[in-house]
C-alpha cells in the first residue's frame, strides 16, 4: 500500500548524512517506472533541504541533524509519478517525529529569588516558590522533568537545614524551628534544579529568604530606676526621659514603645508620651505639683509596644522618684474676689472691710498689702492688717467709676520671700444707696402762650434708688404760686406746670420745690418764656406789623 507509518528520528543524530530513514514505495511500480518526490516544510519549503528522497528508489533521506526544541514534528507529502509525469498515487502524508535527547540544562527563571517569612513560624510554613524551565521533553521522557533541591544554606544557624524545597513544585518551606530575626535576619539558599527528575544536568540559583519581624521581644527599661527634681506648680514641665531597648525591628510597631503610668500618680499629676524618633518615654507634669502637700512622688511606669506581643512576654517596669522642689509661692487672697456691701457716703476714715491673703508656703512669711487700682481714689489699705478704709466719699451715683452699684478695686499682697512674690485680689464694693439726691425736673426751660396756655409736663428724675425716689411732691415757692400751679401726676413721676394768670410777654423764673418719697427736697428754677399767643407754641412769634 501507498502508506508509511510515522517515522521517529532522534534529534542531534551524528550521521553520516544523508541518512536513509524509510523507503517510499508504490505497488504501481510493477506496471511502470515510478519517480518519487516529497513536498512540505523541511523539503521544498522552509526549512528547505532537511529531508530529500532518492527519486528512483523512494528512499527518504535526512540531510542534517535535527533539533526537537526547534521543530518537534515534520509533516511532509510523498508523491509518485510515472515517466510522463502523471500522478499514479494520491499524495501520501509522512509524519516525522523528532525524539528528544537531554541536550538542555534546566534554567532558573531568575538568578536570585526573594521571599520572606515571619520569624518563629511553625515548620511547614511556605516561604516562596522558585521556578526553573527545561526546553527538553517532559511528557514522554524525563529529560525535561526538573527536580528541585537545596544545595546549601548560609548562615547555618541555628541549623543547617532551616528550609526544604518541594522537589516538583519548587515551593520552599520552613522545616526547622528557631527562625529568629534578631539572630539571623536573612538566609541565602543555593538552590538546584536537576533534570531527568533529579538524575541529570544541574543548574543553580540563589534564593534569599528575609526573616520578617514578629513582636517577640519586649521593650526593656535601661536603666530601670530614675530620680528627678521638679519645681512645684510647673505644668507641662519635662520631669524625665525614660529609655528603653527593644530588639525588634527599629521604627516598626513591634519596636515603638507605649508607656503607661501603673501606679503612684493618685492625683493624675503626670503624663507620659513617646518620643517619635528616640522611642524614649517623656514624663511631664499634667498639673502643678504642691511641695507643701507632697514633696515626693514615686511613679511606676510600664512599657509595651504599639503592636501586641506574639507570645506571653514579661513587661518591663521603671521606678521614677520625683522630688518636688519648694518654690516661693505668691500669696493668695481669700477669696480671690471679695464682695462687700457698704453705704455710699460713709465718713472718711470709716472701715470698709478687712481683705487678707494666705501664703501657700509653710514658712511664716510676712505679707504686706497695698491698693493696686482704685480709680476714684476713695480707699486706703493698711499694709500690715489688710484693713480697707474710706478716704474719699463713696458715691454710688458717680457714673464714671461705679457700674451697676459696684465699685471695683484691685489690691496686692506681697510676701517677704527671696525673691518676693505678689498676688492680687479683687474687691467689689456694692454701694448701698443713701437718699442723697433730690428730684430734678426736666426740661428746665419752657415756652408758653399767655392766652389759652397749654399745660407744661415736666419729667421728674432722681439719681437715688427706690425707695428714695417716687412718689414725688411739688410745691411752688417765692410767690411763684401767684401765677403758676404745679401738680404731680397720679404715678408721681411727672409734674404739670400751668399758667393761671395773664402775664405779658417776657421771661420769668418759676421756683419749683420737688421732694422724693424720703422727703429729700430739691429747689429748681424753671425759666419760663411767656409769649403773646394762643394755645401751643415753641418759640415766641415776632412783633405783628399792620399793613
Amino acid at each position: 500500500d501507498w502508506v508509511v507509518a510515522p517515522i521517529s528520528v532522534p534529534e542531534n543524530g551524528k550521521g553520516p548524512f544523508p541518512q536513509r530513514l524509510n523507503q517510499l514505495k508504490s505497488n504501481k511500480d510493477r506496471d511502470t517506472k515510478i519517480f518519487y518526490s516529497i513536498t512540505g516544510p523541511g523539503a521544498d519549503s522552509p526549512p528547505e533541504g532537511v529531508f530529500a528522497v532518492e527519486k528512483e528508489t523512494g528512499w527518504l533521506l535526512l540531510n542534517k541533524p535535527l533539533d526537537r526544541e526547534e521543530i518537534a514534528k515534520y509533516e511532509l507529502f510523498g508523491h509518485a509519478v510515472s515517466e510522463n509525469g502523471a500522478s499514479v498515487e494520491d499524495p501520501m502524508n509522512i509524519s516525522i517525529i523528532v525524539t528528544d535527547q537531554n541536550d538542555h540544562k534546566p534554567k532558573f527563571t531568575q538568578d536570585t529569588f526573594r521571599g520572606s517569612v515571619l520569624e518563629g513560624v511553625l515548620p511547614g510554613t511556605s516561604v516562596m516558590q522558585v521556578t526553573a524551565t527545561d526546553e527538553d521533553d517532559a511528557i514522554y521522557t524525563y529529560n525535561g522533568v526538573v527536580a528541585y533541591s537545596i544545595h546549601s544554606q548560609e548562615p547555618k544557624d541555628p541549623h543547617d537545614l532551616m528550609f526544604t524545597i518541594h522537589r516538583s513544585t519548587g515551593t520552599i518551606s520552613v522545616i526547622s524551628s528557631g527562625l529568629d530575626r534578631e539572630k539571623v535576619p536573612e538566609y541565602t539558599l543555593t538552590i538546584q534544579a536537576t533534570d531527568m527528575d533529579g538524575d541529570g544536568s544541574t543548574t543553580t540559583a540563589v534564593a534569599v529568604v528575609e526573616i520578617l519581624d514578629a513582636n517577640d521581644n519586649a521593650p526593656m527599661f535601661d536603666p530601670q530606676k530614675y530620680e528627678a527634681h521638679v519645681p512645684e506648680n510647673a505644668v507641662g514641665h519635662e520631669v524625665q526621659r525614660l529609655t528603653v531597648t527593644d530588639l525588634d525591628a527599629p521604627n516598626s510597631p513591634a519596636w515603638r514603645a507605649t508607656y503607661l503610668i501603673m501606679g503612684g500618680d493618685d492625683g493624675d499629676h503626670f503624663t507620659i508620651t513617646t518620643h517619635p524618633e528616640s522611642n524614649q518615654g517623656i514624663l511631664t507634669t499634667r498639673k502643678g505639683l504642691d511641695f507643701e502637700a507632697k514633696n515626693q512622688h514615686t511613679l511606676y511606669v510600664e512599657v509595651t509596644n504599639e503592636a501586641p506581643f506574639v507570645l506571653k512576654l514579661p513587661t518591663s517596669t521603671a521606678t521614677i522618684v520625683v522630688h518636688v522642689e519648694d518654690v516661693n509661692e505668691a500669696p493668695v487672697f481669700v477669696p480671690p474676689s471679695k464682695v462687700v456691701e457698704v453705704q455710699e457716703g460713709i465718713p472718711t476714715g470709716e472701715p470698709v472691710c478687712v481683705y487678707t491673703a494666705e501664703d501657700p508656703d509653710k514658712e511664716n512669711q510676712k505679707i504686706s498689702y497695698r491698693i493696686l487700682r482704685d480709680p476714684a481714689g476713695w480707699l486706703a489699705m493698711d499694709p500690715d492688717s489688710g484693713q480697707v478704709t474710706a478716704v474719699g466719699t463713696l458715691d454710688r451715683e458717680d457714673e464714671q467709676f461705679v457700674r451697676n452699684n459696684i465699685y471695683e478695686v484691685m489690691v496686692l499682697a506681697m510676701d517677704n520671700g527671696s525673691p518676693p512674690t505678689t498676688g492680687t485680689g479683687t474687691l467689689l464694693l456694692t454701694l448701698i444707696d443713701v437718699n442723697d439726691h433730690g428730684p430734678v425736673p426736666e426740661p428746665r426751660q419752657i415756652t408758653i402762650c399767655n392766652q389759652s396756655p397749654v399745660r407744661q409736663v415736666l419729667n421728674i428724675t432722681d439719681k437715688d434708688l427706690s425707695p428714695h425716689t417716687s412718689p414725688f411732691q411739688a410745691q411752688l415757692t417765692d410767690d411763684s404760686d401767684i401765677y403758676w400751679t404745679a401738680e404731680v401726676n397720679e404715678e408721681g413721676d411727672t409734674v404739670v406746670l400751668s399758667l393761671k394768670k395773664f402775664l405779658k410777654q417776657d421771661t420769668y423764673d418759676v421756683h419749683l420745690s420737688l421732694s422724693d418719697h424720703g422727703n429729700k427736697e430739691q429747689l429748681t428754677v424753671i425759666r419760663a418764656t411767656v409769649c403773646d399767643c394762643h394755645g401751643h407754641v415753641e418759640t415766641c412769634p415776632g412783633p405783628w406789623k399792620g399793613g
Epitope: L118, V121, P123, G124, D160, S177, G178, V310, K312
Partner: antibody, heavy 117, light 111 residues
C-alpha cells in the same frame, strides 16, 4: 540529651477539663517547636497540636480545634496542653514531642488520659 | 484513615528479612526526603530508628535500612530478631499546617 517528662493525666468525666504539662531538659527549649501526639488504646499515632519555639504560632488537629489549647513557658522550659470539653474519644496516651532539626521527633514517655463517666 | 498507608501487619522468622512499605503522595513522601521511621514496643514511647529516608541515629542497628521510590518509602529489617517485634510507624514532612504525617502503623511479628 533531650528529656521530656509529661504529667497531669488522669481520669476525667466527659465535658471535664485537664491540663497536661511537659517538662523539657537537655536542649535549648525556646529554639524548638513542640508537639502533642496521642495514641488511643490499640490505635496508631495521631497528631494533636504544635507550637513554635517562640509560642507565636500554633496548630491544632480538626478533632480538637476549639477545645484544646497548646502553650509554653520558655522561662520554665515547660509545654502545656489545656484540654476542655473532653470526650470519650479523647482517651489516649498523650506524648509530648520535640521537633528536631531534621524533621524528626523526640518523645516523652507519655501520660494517660481517660475520659469516662 | 491515616495520611500515609502502611500494611497492618508483616511477619518473618528469625534471621529472615522483611520490608514495610509506606505510601504517600507527591506532596509528602514524594516531595521531600524527610521520611522517618519509629519503632514502638508495647507500653513504651516511640523510638526513632531512621530519619531522612535512610539515616540511622547512633545506637540503631545497621540491620535497619530505608529507601524511597516515588511516593513510597520502605523500611527493611534484615536478620530478624525477637526484639524486633514491635509496631513500626512511618512519618513524612509535608508543607502546610499539618507539617508531619503519620502512617497507620505496621505490627511486625517475629515467628
Amino acid at each position: 540529651e533531650v528529656q521530656l517528662l509529661e504529667s497531669g493525666g488522669g481520669l476525667v468525666q466527659p465535658g471535664g477539663s485537664l491540663r497536661l504539662s511537659c517538662a523539657a531538659s537537655g536542649f535549648t527549649f525556646s529554639s524548638y517547636a513542640m508537639s502533642w501526639v496521642r495514641q488511643a488504646p490499640g490505635k496508631g499515632l495521631e497528631w494533636v497540636s504544635a507550637i513554635s519555639g517562640s509560642g507565636g504560632s500554633t496548630y491544632y488537629a480538626d478533632s480538637v480545634k476549639g477545645r484544646f489549647t497548646i502553650s509554653r513557658d520558655n522561662s520554665k522550659n515547660t509545654l502545656y496542653l489545656q484540654m476542655n470539653s473532653l470526650r470519650a474519644e479523647d482517651t489516649a496516651v498523650y506524648y509530648c514531642a520535640s521537633w528536631g532539626p531534621r524533621a524528626t521527633l523526640d518523645w516523652g514517655q507519655g501520660t494517660m488520659v481517660t475520659v469516662s463517666s | 484513615q491515616s495520611a500515609l498507608t502502611q500494611p497492618a501487619s508483616v511477619s518473618g522468622s528469625p534471621g529472615q528479612s522483611i520490608t514495610i512499605s509506606c505510601t504517600g503522595t507527591s506532596n509528602d513522601v514524594g516531595a521531600y526526603n524527610y521520611v522517618s521511621w519509629y519503632q514502638q514496643h508495647p507500653g513504651k514511647a516511640p523510638k526513632l530508628i531512621l530519619s531522612e529516608v535512610n539515616k540511622r541515629p547512633s545506637g540503631v542497628s545497621n540491620r535497619f535500612s530505608g529507601s524511597k521510590s516515588g511516593n513510597t518509602a520502605s523500611l527493611s529489617i534484615s536478620g530478624l530478631q525477637a526484639e524486633d517485634e514491635a509496631d513500626y510507624y512511618c512519618s513524612s514532612f509535608t508543607s502546610g499546617s499539618t507539617f508531619m504525617l503519620f502512617g497507620g502503623g505496621t505490627k511486625l511479628t517475629v515467628l
